[in-house]
Amino acid sequence: QAVPPYASENQTCRDQEKEYYEPQHRICCSRCPPGTYVSAKCSRIRDTVCATCAENSYNEHWNYLTICQLCRPCDPVMGLEEIAPCTSKRKTQCRCQPGMFCAAWALECTHCELLSDCPPGTEAELKDEVGKGNNHCVPCKAGHFQNTSSPSARCQPHTRCENQGLVEAAPGTAQSDTTCKNPLEPLPPEMSGTMLM
Protein backbone atom coordinates (compact mmCIF):
# COMPACT_ATOMS: atom_id res chain seq x y z
CA GLN A 1 0.00 0.00 0.00
CA ALA A 2 1.64 3.23 -1.20
CA VAL A 3 1.79 6.15 1.18
CA PRO A 4 1.66 9.68 -0.29
CA PRO A 5 3.46 11.09 -2.07
CA TYR A 6 3.49 8.29 -4.64
CA ALA A 7 3.79 8.16 -8.42
CA SER A 8 0.63 8.05 -10.51
CA GLU A 9 0.89 7.38 -14.23
CA ASN A 10 -2.86 7.52 -14.96
CA GLN A 11 -3.42 10.76 -12.99
CA THR A 12 -5.79 9.14 -10.49
CA CYS A 13 -5.23 8.36 -6.84
CA ARG A 14 -6.35 5.38 -4.82
CA ASP A 15 -8.31 7.31 -2.20
CA GLN A 16 -10.14 10.09 -4.01
CA GLU A 17 -11.54 11.56 -0.78
CA LYS A 18 -8.23 11.88 1.08
CA GLU A 19 -5.72 12.16 -1.78
CA TYR A 20 -5.38 14.29 -4.90
CA TYR A 21 -3.27 14.28 -8.05
CA GLU A 22 -0.65 17.02 -8.11
CA PRO A 23 0.12 17.65 -11.79
CA GLN A 24 3.43 19.52 -11.57
CA HIS A 25 5.19 16.67 -9.80
CA ARG A 26 2.90 13.98 -11.32
CA ILE A 27 2.19 12.39 -7.95
CA CYS A 28 -0.60 11.60 -5.51
CA CYS A 29 -0.54 13.65 -2.31
CA SER A 30 -2.61 13.75 0.87
CA ARG A 31 -5.47 16.19 1.17
CA CYS A 32 -5.80 18.10 4.43
CA PRO A 33 -8.55 16.95 6.83
CA PRO A 34 -11.58 19.11 7.67
CA GLY A 35 -10.63 22.01 9.91
CA THR A 36 -7.20 22.41 8.26
CA TYR A 37 -5.59 23.86 5.11
CA VAL A 38 -2.38 23.37 3.10
CA SER A 39 0.47 25.26 4.74
CA ALA A 40 3.13 23.66 2.50
CA LYS A 41 2.40 22.00 -0.84
CA CYS A 42 3.55 18.47 -1.51
CA SER A 43 6.35 17.41 -3.82
CA ARG A 44 7.99 14.12 -4.75
CA ILE A 45 10.04 14.29 -1.57
CA ARG A 46 7.47 15.40 1.01
CA ASP A 47 3.76 15.07 1.57
CA THR A 48 1.32 17.94 2.04
CA VAL A 49 1.79 19.85 5.30
CA CYS A 50 -1.49 20.90 6.91
CA ALA A 51 -2.26 23.54 9.54
CA THR A 52 -5.38 24.21 11.62
CA CYS A 53 -7.77 26.90 10.43
CA ALA A 54 -7.54 30.13 12.43
CA GLU A 55 -10.40 31.31 14.61
CA ASN A 56 -13.47 32.42 12.63
CA SER A 57 -12.52 30.31 9.61
CA TYR A 58 -13.22 26.78 8.46
CA ASN A 59 -12.78 24.07 5.82
CA GLU A 60 -15.58 21.51 5.75
CA HIS A 61 -14.06 18.75 3.62
CA TRP A 62 -10.80 16.93 2.91
CA ASN A 63 -9.11 19.55 0.77
CA TYR A 64 -5.97 20.94 -0.83
CA LEU A 65 -6.91 24.57 -0.28
CA THR A 66 -4.20 27.02 0.71
CA ILE A 67 -6.65 29.09 2.79
CA CYS A 68 -9.60 28.49 5.11
CA GLN A 69 -13.01 29.94 4.34
CA LEU A 70 -14.14 32.90 6.44
CA CYS A 71 -17.07 32.21 8.79
CA ARG A 72 -20.09 34.30 7.87
CA PRO A 73 -22.93 35.22 10.25
CA CYS A 74 -26.54 34.45 9.41
CA ASP A 75 -27.93 37.64 7.87
CA PRO A 76 -31.11 38.76 9.68
CA VAL A 77 -31.80 41.25 6.88
CA MET A 78 -32.17 38.22 4.63
CA GLY A 79 -34.50 36.60 7.16
CA LEU A 80 -31.92 34.10 8.47
CA GLU A 81 -31.14 33.04 12.01
CA GLU A 82 -28.35 30.89 13.47
CA ILE A 83 -29.01 27.34 14.60
CA ALA A 84 -25.35 26.30 15.12
CA PRO A 85 -22.17 28.40 15.33
CA CYS A 86 -19.24 28.20 12.90
CA THR A 87 -16.45 25.79 13.85
CA SER A 88 -13.12 25.03 12.14
CA LYS A 89 -14.85 22.10 10.39
CA ARG A 90 -18.27 23.56 9.64
CA LYS A 91 -19.73 26.86 8.45
CA THR A 92 -22.37 28.68 10.47
CA GLN A 93 -25.65 26.79 10.22
CA CYS A 94 -28.58 29.08 9.37
CA ARG A 95 -32.29 28.67 8.86
CA CYS A 96 -35.22 30.91 8.01
CA GLN A 97 -36.69 32.83 10.89
CA PRO A 98 -40.09 31.64 12.16
CA GLY A 99 -42.89 32.56 9.79
CA MET A 100 -40.53 32.69 6.81
CA PHE A 101 -39.52 30.36 3.97
CA CYS A 102 -36.46 30.06 1.75
CA ALA A 103 -36.99 32.08 -1.42
CA ALA A 104 -33.43 31.85 -2.85
CA TRP A 105 -31.26 28.77 -2.73
CA ALA A 106 -27.63 28.46 -3.87
CA LEU A 107 -26.20 25.34 -2.17
CA GLU A 108 -27.76 26.82 0.94
CA CYS A 109 -30.54 29.29 1.69
CA THR A 110 -29.49 32.87 0.96
CA HIS A 111 -32.80 34.75 1.31
CA CYS A 112 -36.02 34.13 3.22
CA GLU A 113 -39.43 35.69 2.71
CA LEU A 114 -42.59 35.84 4.81
CA LEU A 115 -44.86 32.83 4.50
CA SER A 116 -48.16 33.53 2.76
CA ASP A 117 -51.31 33.59 4.90
CA CYS A 118 -53.69 30.69 4.61
CA PRO A 119 -57.29 32.02 4.47
CA PRO A 120 -60.06 30.83 6.80
CA GLY A 121 -61.08 27.26 6.07
CA THR A 122 -57.53 26.24 5.11
CA GLU A 123 -54.19 25.47 6.73
CA ALA A 124 -50.58 25.18 5.55
CA GLU A 125 -49.72 21.70 4.34
CA LEU A 126 -47.08 20.22 6.65
CA LYS A 127 -43.64 19.89 5.02
CA ASP A 128 -40.71 17.58 5.81
CA GLU A 129 -38.46 20.61 6.42
CA VAL A 130 -39.64 23.85 7.96
CA GLY A 131 -38.73 26.94 5.94
CA LYS A 132 -38.02 25.03 2.72
CA GLY A 133 -40.88 26.51 0.70
CA ASN A 134 -43.83 28.85 0.81
CA ASN A 135 -47.12 27.73 2.28
CA HIS A 136 -49.34 25.47 0.25
CA CYS A 137 -52.80 26.00 1.73
CA VAL A 138 -55.10 22.97 1.86
CA PRO A 139 -58.76 22.86 2.97
CA CYS A 140 -59.50 21.77 6.51
CA LYS A 141 -60.47 18.11 6.56
CA ALA A 142 -64.03 17.11 7.52
CA GLY A 143 -64.90 17.94 11.12
CA HIS A 144 -62.27 20.70 11.37
CA PHE A 145 -62.21 24.49 11.02
CA GLN A 146 -59.79 27.43 10.84
CA ASN A 147 -61.24 30.94 11.20
CA THR A 148 -58.27 33.31 10.67
CA SER A 149 -55.95 34.49 7.89
CA SER A 150 -52.61 33.24 9.16
CA PRO A 151 -49.41 31.58 7.87
CA SER A 152 -49.33 29.15 10.78
CA ALA A 153 -52.82 28.58 12.22
CA ARG A 154 -53.88 24.95 12.18
CA CYS A 155 -57.36 23.55 11.54
CA GLN A 156 -58.95 22.54 14.84
CA PRO A 157 -61.59 19.86 15.41
CA HIS A 158 -65.16 21.09 15.70
CA THR A 159 -66.47 21.31 19.27
CA ARG A 160 -68.54 18.26 20.25
CA CYS A 161 -71.43 19.91 22.08
CA GLU A 162 -72.49 16.66 23.81
CA ASN A 163 -69.08 16.45 25.52
CA GLN A 164 -70.00 19.67 27.33
CA GLY A 165 -73.59 18.63 28.14
CA LEU A 166 -74.85 20.93 25.40
CA VAL A 167 -76.65 20.47 22.14
CA GLU A 168 -75.77 21.70 18.66
CA ALA A 169 -77.39 24.98 17.71
CA ALA A 170 -75.57 25.33 14.35
CA PRO A 171 -73.19 22.89 12.65
CA GLY A 172 -69.53 23.74 12.20
CA THR A 173 -68.09 24.65 8.82
CA ALA A 174 -64.53 24.76 7.48
CA GLN A 175 -64.40 28.39 8.65
CA SER A 176 -66.34 28.24 11.91
CA ASP A 177 -66.82 26.05 14.93
CA THR A 178 -70.02 24.30 15.90
CA THR A 179 -72.46 26.50 17.83
CA CYS A 180 -73.76 24.87 21.01
CA LYS A 181 -76.70 25.75 23.28
CA ASN A 182 -78.13 24.76 26.62
CA PRO A 183 -80.67 22.00 25.93
CA LEU A 184 -83.23 23.69 28.22
CA GLU A 185 -83.20 27.07 26.47
CA PRO A 186 -84.51 27.74 23.03
CA LEU A 187 -82.16 29.75 20.82
CA PRO A 188 -83.53 33.26 20.13
CA PRO A 189 -83.15 34.31 16.48
CA GLU A 190 -80.79 37.17 17.33
CA MET A 191 -78.44 34.72 19.19
CA SER A 192 -77.97 32.25 16.37
CA GLY A 193 -74.33 31.44 15.68
CA THR A 194 -73.33 31.85 19.34
CA MET A 195 -73.18 29.43 22.20
CA LEU A 196 -75.63 29.97 25.08
CA MET A 197 -74.84 28.71 28.53
Epitope: A7, E9, P23, Q24, H25, R26, I45, R46
Partner: antibody, heavy 120, light 107 residues
Framework: EVQLVESGGGLVKPGGSLRLSCAAS????????MYWFRQAPGKGLEWVAT????????YYPDSVKGRFTISRDNAKNSLYLQMSSLRAEDTAVYYC?????????????WGQGTTVTVSS | DIQMTQSPSSLSASVGDRVTITCKAG??????LSWYQQKPGKAPKLLIY???RLADGVPSRFSGSGSGTDYTLTISSLQPEDFATYYC?????????FGGGTKLEIK
Protein backbone atom coordinates in the same frame (compact mmCIF):
# COMPACT_ATOMS: atom_id res chain seq x y z
CA GLU B 1 14.52 8.01 -33.29
CA VAL B 2 13.51 10.77 -30.85
CA GLN B 3 14.34 14.23 -32.16
CA LEU B 4 13.79 17.70 -30.73
CA VAL B 5 14.71 20.63 -32.96
CA GLU B 6 14.55 24.19 -31.62
CA SER B 7 14.25 27.34 -33.72
CA GLY B 8 13.39 31.02 -33.36
CA GLY B 9 16.43 32.28 -31.47
CA GLY B 10 18.15 35.52 -32.38
CA LEU B 11 19.19 39.00 -31.31
CA VAL B 12 16.56 41.12 -29.56
CA LYS B 13 16.63 44.43 -27.69
CA PRO B 14 15.86 44.65 -23.96
CA GLY B 15 12.09 44.85 -23.47
CA GLY B 16 11.52 43.03 -26.75
CA SER B 17 9.80 39.73 -27.50
CA LEU B 18 10.72 36.46 -29.17
CA ARG B 19 8.95 33.16 -29.82
CA LEU B 20 10.89 29.92 -29.73
CA SER B 21 9.62 26.73 -31.32
CA CYS B 22 10.52 23.08 -30.91
CA ALA B 23 9.57 20.43 -33.47
CA ALA B 24 9.29 16.96 -31.94
CA SER B 25 9.42 13.65 -33.80
CA UNK B 26 10.02 9.94 -33.20
CA UNK B 27 7.64 9.60 -30.23
CA UNK B 28 4.01 10.21 -29.23
CA UNK B 29 4.39 13.87 -28.34
CA UNK B 30 1.01 14.15 -26.59
CA UNK B 31 2.04 11.54 -23.99
CA UNK B 32 4.87 13.61 -22.53
CA UNK B 33 5.41 16.61 -20.28
CA MET B 34 7.73 19.04 -22.04
CA TYR B 35 10.19 21.58 -20.65
CA TRP B 36 12.38 24.48 -21.60
CA PHE B 37 15.78 24.80 -19.92
CA ARG B 38 18.42 27.43 -20.60
CA GLN B 39 22.14 27.98 -20.18
CA ALA B 40 23.69 31.43 -20.02
CA PRO B 41 27.13 31.77 -21.71
CA GLY B 42 29.74 30.01 -19.59
CA LYS B 43 27.17 29.30 -16.87
CA GLY B 44 25.14 26.38 -15.54
CA LEU B 45 21.73 25.05 -16.48
CA GLU B 46 18.41 26.57 -15.36
CA TRP B 47 14.82 25.37 -15.59
CA VAL B 48 12.59 27.85 -17.49
CA ALA B 49 9.12 26.33 -18.03
CA THR B 50 7.03 23.15 -17.90
CA UNK B 51 3.85 22.14 -19.73
CA UNK B 52 1.74 19.06 -19.04
CA UNK B 53 1.04 16.42 -21.69
CA UNK B 54 -2.37 17.84 -22.61
CA UNK B 55 -1.29 21.46 -22.16
CA UNK B 56 -3.66 22.19 -19.28
CA UNK B 57 -0.94 22.92 -16.73
CA UNK B 58 2.03 25.26 -17.02
CA TYR B 59 4.73 26.08 -14.48
CA TYR B 60 7.55 28.62 -14.27
CA PRO B 61 10.31 29.66 -11.87
CA ASP B 62 10.01 33.14 -10.36
CA SER B 63 12.74 34.45 -12.66
CA VAL B 64 10.49 34.26 -15.76
CA LYS B 65 6.95 34.13 -14.31
CA GLY B 66 4.68 36.69 -15.96
CA ARG B 67 7.11 37.26 -18.85
CA PHE B 68 7.38 33.82 -20.50
CA THR B 69 4.56 31.58 -21.70
CA ILE B 70 4.97 27.93 -22.62
CA SER B 71 2.43 26.32 -24.94
CA ARG B 72 2.09 23.32 -27.19
CA ASP B 73 0.19 22.11 -30.26
CA ASN B 74 -0.12 18.34 -30.01
CA ALA B 75 -1.62 18.11 -33.49
CA LYS B 76 1.58 19.68 -34.87
CA ASN B 77 3.98 17.94 -32.43
CA SER B 78 5.26 21.37 -31.48
CA LEU B 79 6.33 23.13 -28.30
CA TYR B 80 6.62 26.92 -27.98
CA LEU B 81 8.08 29.52 -25.64
CA GLN B 82 6.77 33.07 -25.97
CA MET B 83 9.23 35.43 -24.30
CA SER B 84 8.41 39.07 -23.62
CA SER B 85 9.90 41.94 -21.58
CA LEU B 86 13.28 40.39 -22.31
CA ARG B 87 16.28 41.32 -20.18
CA ALA B 88 20.03 41.01 -20.66
CA GLU B 89 20.04 38.13 -18.14
CA ASP B 90 17.73 36.12 -20.43
CA THR B 91 20.64 35.77 -22.89
CA ALA B 92 21.23 32.01 -23.13
CA VAL B 93 20.99 28.86 -25.19
CA TYR B 94 17.42 27.55 -24.80
CA TYR B 95 16.83 23.81 -24.84
CA CYS B 96 13.59 21.94 -25.52
CA UNK B 97 13.50 18.85 -23.28
CA UNK B 98 11.30 15.77 -22.83
CA UNK B 99 10.52 14.38 -19.38
CA UNK B 100 10.31 10.60 -19.12
CA UNK B 101 6.65 9.66 -18.59
CA UNK B 102 7.11 6.81 -16.09
CA UNK B 103 7.80 7.08 -12.39
CA UNK B 104 11.39 8.35 -12.35
CA UNK B 105 10.84 11.80 -13.86
CA UNK B 106 14.24 12.29 -15.51
CA UNK B 107 14.92 14.32 -18.65
CA UNK B 108 15.85 11.81 -21.30
CA UNK B 109 16.03 13.81 -24.54
CA TRP B 110 17.31 17.33 -25.18
CA GLY B 111 17.27 19.39 -28.36
CA GLN B 112 20.47 20.94 -29.73
CA GLY B 113 19.43 24.37 -28.43
CA THR B 114 18.71 27.79 -29.94
CA THR B 115 20.59 30.94 -28.94
CA VAL B 116 18.81 34.04 -27.64
CA THR B 117 20.83 37.23 -27.26
CA VAL B 118 19.28 40.23 -25.50
CA SER B 119 21.35 43.33 -26.16
CA SER B 120 20.89 46.93 -27.16
CA ASP C 1 14.48 26.19 -3.39
CA ILE C 2 16.74 23.19 -2.92
CA GLN C 3 20.40 24.17 -3.21
CA MET C 4 22.64 21.68 -5.03
CA THR C 5 26.32 21.95 -4.16
CA GLN C 6 28.53 20.13 -6.64
CA SER C 7 32.23 19.46 -6.12
CA PRO C 8 34.83 19.82 -7.33
CA SER C 9 34.04 22.63 -9.78
CA SER C 10 36.95 21.45 -11.95
CA LEU C 11 39.08 18.35 -12.04
CA SER C 12 42.18 17.29 -13.99
CA ALA C 13 42.62 13.58 -14.61
CA SER C 14 44.25 11.16 -17.00
CA VAL C 15 42.84 8.45 -19.24
CA GLY C 16 42.33 5.31 -17.13
CA ASP C 17 41.86 7.22 -13.87
CA ARG C 18 38.95 6.62 -11.53
CA VAL C 19 37.06 9.86 -10.98
CA THR C 20 34.41 10.79 -8.41
CA ILE C 21 32.13 13.85 -8.51
CA THR C 22 29.80 14.64 -5.61
CA CYS C 23 26.57 16.52 -5.23
CA LYS C 24 25.10 17.58 -1.90
CA ALA C 25 21.45 18.59 -1.68
CA GLY C 26 20.13 21.15 0.80
CA UNK C 27 17.61 18.55 2.00
CA UNK C 28 16.74 14.90 1.48
CA UNK C 29 15.76 14.50 -2.18
CA UNK C 30 14.82 10.83 -1.93
CA UNK C 31 17.05 9.76 -4.84
CA UNK C 32 15.34 12.12 -7.32
CA LEU C 33 18.72 12.99 -8.77
CA SER C 34 20.10 12.58 -12.27
CA TRP C 35 23.52 13.19 -13.80
CA TYR C 36 24.20 14.79 -17.20
CA GLN C 37 27.27 15.09 -19.38
CA GLN C 38 27.73 18.15 -21.59
CA LYS C 39 30.37 18.76 -24.22
CA PRO C 40 31.11 22.27 -25.59
CA GLY C 41 28.42 23.49 -27.98
CA LYS C 42 26.28 20.41 -27.36
CA ALA C 43 23.15 19.64 -25.36
CA PRO C 44 23.36 17.81 -22.04
CA LYS C 45 23.13 14.01 -22.24
CA LEU C 46 21.50 11.86 -19.56
CA LEU C 47 23.89 9.43 -17.82
CA ILE C 48 22.26 8.37 -14.55
CA TYR C 49 18.69 8.69 -13.24
CA UNK C 50 17.12 8.00 -9.87
CA UNK C 51 20.60 8.33 -8.32
CA UNK C 52 21.86 4.90 -9.35
CA ARG C 53 20.24 3.76 -12.60
CA LEU C 54 22.24 3.78 -15.80
CA ALA C 55 20.48 5.42 -18.77
CA ASP C 56 20.11 3.50 -22.04
CA GLY C 57 23.27 3.43 -24.15
CA VAL C 58 25.55 4.79 -21.41
CA PRO C 59 28.79 2.83 -20.86
CA SER C 60 28.97 0.78 -17.66
CA ARG C 61 32.09 2.65 -16.48
CA PHE C 62 29.64 5.35 -15.31
CA SER C 63 27.86 4.65 -12.03
CA GLY C 64 25.83 6.59 -9.49
CA SER C 65 25.43 6.12 -5.78
CA GLY C 66 24.05 7.88 -2.75
CA SER C 67 20.81 8.66 -0.97
CA GLY C 68 19.30 11.35 1.25
CA THR C 69 21.37 14.48 0.65
CA ASP C 70 24.66 13.03 -0.66
CA TYR C 71 25.17 11.66 -4.17
CA THR C 72 28.16 10.57 -6.23
CA LEU C 73 28.95 10.04 -9.90
CA THR C 74 31.88 7.71 -10.52
CA ILE C 75 33.74 7.05 -13.77
CA SER C 76 35.72 3.87 -13.13
CA SER C 77 38.25 4.26 -15.95
CA LEU C 78 38.36 7.54 -17.83
CA GLN C 79 38.20 7.41 -21.60
CA PRO C 80 39.21 10.28 -23.93
CA GLU C 81 35.54 10.97 -24.80
CA ASP C 82 34.66 11.46 -21.12
CA PHE C 83 36.37 14.87 -20.85
CA ALA C 84 33.36 17.19 -20.53
CA THR C 85 31.32 19.09 -17.95
CA TYR C 86 29.05 17.09 -15.62
CA TYR C 87 25.91 18.36 -13.90
CA CYS C 88 23.68 16.90 -11.22
CA UNK C 89 19.98 17.81 -11.17
CA UNK C 90 17.44 17.36 -8.40
CA UNK C 91 13.87 16.83 -9.57
CA UNK C 92 12.30 15.93 -6.27
CA UNK C 93 10.80 19.34 -5.67
CA UNK C 94 10.06 22.28 -7.95
CA UNK C 95 11.87 24.43 -8.89
CA UNK C 96 14.23 21.85 -10.34
CA UNK C 97 17.80 22.86 -9.55
CA PHE C 98 21.19 21.91 -10.97
CA GLY C 99 24.57 21.69 -9.36
CA GLY C 100 27.12 24.25 -10.54
CA GLY C 101 28.87 21.72 -12.76
CA THR C 102 32.22 19.93 -12.73
CA LYS C 103 34.59 20.52 -15.62
CA LEU C 104 36.66 17.39 -16.19
CA GLU C 105 39.89 18.20 -18.04
CA ILE C 106 42.81 16.16 -19.33
CA LYS C 107 45.84 16.31 -17.05
Amino acid sequence: EVQLVESGGGLVKPGGSLRLSCAASGFTFSDYYMYWFRQAPGKGLEWVATISDGGSYTYYPDSVKGRFTISRDNAKNSLYLQMSSLRAEDTAVYYCVREENGNFYYFDYWGQGTTVTVSS
Amino acid sequence: DIQMTQSPSSLSASVGDRVTITCKAGQDIKSYLSWYQQKPGKAPKLLIYYATRLADGVPSRFSGSGSGTDYTLTISSLQPEDFATYYCLQHGESPWTFGGGTKLEIK
